[in-house]
């Protein structure tokens, strides 16, 4: 079934940061300014929205799971930031069962926000077909809501 990781483990993730450069000019990925984070969120929003809408059309009548909680925001920063390391394992897990092309684009964007060398939790998808569909829907819904929340915080004045 699902393997969850508590907030304390995620807090530990946030302490792990390396000075690896993506390129000679680029700041380390965990050191992007709010302006660049906002650019990445703007790229993620239509991908996430499109993926969710397509899935809802394809899988009508599937309810949201109450057993899945995407810990998508960091608790240690103001405004809240997207907790890429917590989200990535879910998208890697649902990739074979959803639109691989769009999921790959989402993963590519999330990788840019990820702290360097953070361990990722293992996420296992429910074996039951109906539960699996419910799990995927929940991830997509929570991720869209999460992006909306972060985008609003980045737009609400001084960082």
């Amino acid at each position: 079934m699902l393997s969850h990781t508590g907030p304390s483990r995620f807090a530990l993730f946030l302490l792990c940061s390396m000075e690896t450069l993506l390129s000679s000019h680029m700041a380390p990925t965990h050191q992007l300014p709010p302006s660049d984070v906002r650019k990445i969120i703007l790229e993620l929003q239509p991908l996430s929205r499109g993926l969710l809408e397509d899935y809802q059309k394809k899988e009508t009548g599937v309810p949201e799971s109450n057993r899945t909680l995407l810990l998508c925001l960091t608790s240690d920063s103001q405004p809240p930031r997207l907790n890429s390391s917590a989200i990535l394992p879910y998208f890697r897990a649902i990739r074979p069962l959803s639109d691989k092309n769009i999921i790959d684009k989402i993963i590519e964007q999330l990788d840019k926000l990820k702290f360097q060398h953070e361990p990722e939790t293992e996420i296992s998808v429910p074996a039951d077909t109906f539960e699996c569909k419910s799990f995927i829907l929940t991830i997509l819904q929570q991720f869209s809501a999460c992006l909306e929340s972060v985008f609003k915080s980045l737009n609400s004045g001084p960082q």
């Epitope: 700041a27 300014p33 709010p34």
Partner: antibody
């Protein structure tokens, strides 16, 4: 080498639409972020907005109701449209590339001077 | 919006001397030890040219006479020694927060 070249009319009448083209060589507009900046006669620089590698746009809130940035990937060009111009929009308009997160605008066009006058 | 205040508005320096230009931000432009302030040089009739990125990193092809320093809200561009070819207006720019903003510019003249 990356080169950007602005083109468009040098004179626009008040209330009309200012339309400019930025032609890019040496890089593809399907990577990076492609910006418009203007410099007013008093030397003040203003950031106007961008179109991204995927076609996403974002604008300076001070211009949001009047500005549109579009692109044609087949021509490797991107465009600026500024509606309802006034004499306050008289400026030199530059296009520039923002290639990497956490970096700066490293390549600029030479600029094109636009006067708004009747 | 973050306001960048440059000083002085203009300065005249003799060749071989040091020129110092200040840029003050209305709020911090730092994230995890990186300062998102960049410096450009604009010569008459030309487009802006990137000199320094992230406060202190020299852009490729720019002479080491140019250097940048500072953090949080206070930044400095130093040209040492100044050459006659350095006559230009110098601008700071922040990419920390949207919308990106520029300083008012500092015009450098040679005595």
């Amino acid at each position: 080498e990356v080169q950007l070249q602005e083109s468009g009319p040098s004179l626009v009448k008040p209330s009309q639409t200012l339309s400019l083209t930025c032609s890019v060589t040496g890089d593809s507009i399907t990577s990076g972020y492609w910006n418009w900046i203007r410099k007013f006669p008093g030397n003040k620089l203003e950031y106007m907005g961008y179109i991204s590698y995927s076609g996403i746009t974002d604008y300076n809130p001070s211009l949001k109701s009047r500005i549109s940035i579009t692109r044609d990937t087949s021509k490797n060009q991107y465009y600026l449209q500024l509606n309802s111009v006034t004499t306050e929009d008289t400026a030199t308009y530059y296009c520039a590339r923002y290639g990497n997160y956490g970096y700066a605008m490293d390549y600029w066009g030479q600029g094109t001077s636009v006067t708004v006058s009747s | 919006d973050i306001v960048l205040t440059q000083s002085p508005a203009s300065l005249a320096v003799s060749p071989g001397q040091r020129a110092t230009i200040s840029c003050r931000a209305s709020e911090s432009v730092d994230t995890y030890g990186n300062s998102f302030i960049h410096w450009y040089q604009q010569k008459p009739g030309q487009s802006p040219k990137l000199l320094i990125y992230r406060a202190s990193n020299l852009e490729s092809g720019i002479p080491a006479r140019f250097s940048g320093s500072g953090s949080r809200t206070d930044f400095t561009l130093t040209i040492n020694p100044v050459e006659t070819d350095d006559v230009a207006t110098y601008y700071c720019q922040q990419s920390y927060e949207d919308p990106w903003t520029f300083g008012g510019g500092t015009k450098l003249e040679i005595k």
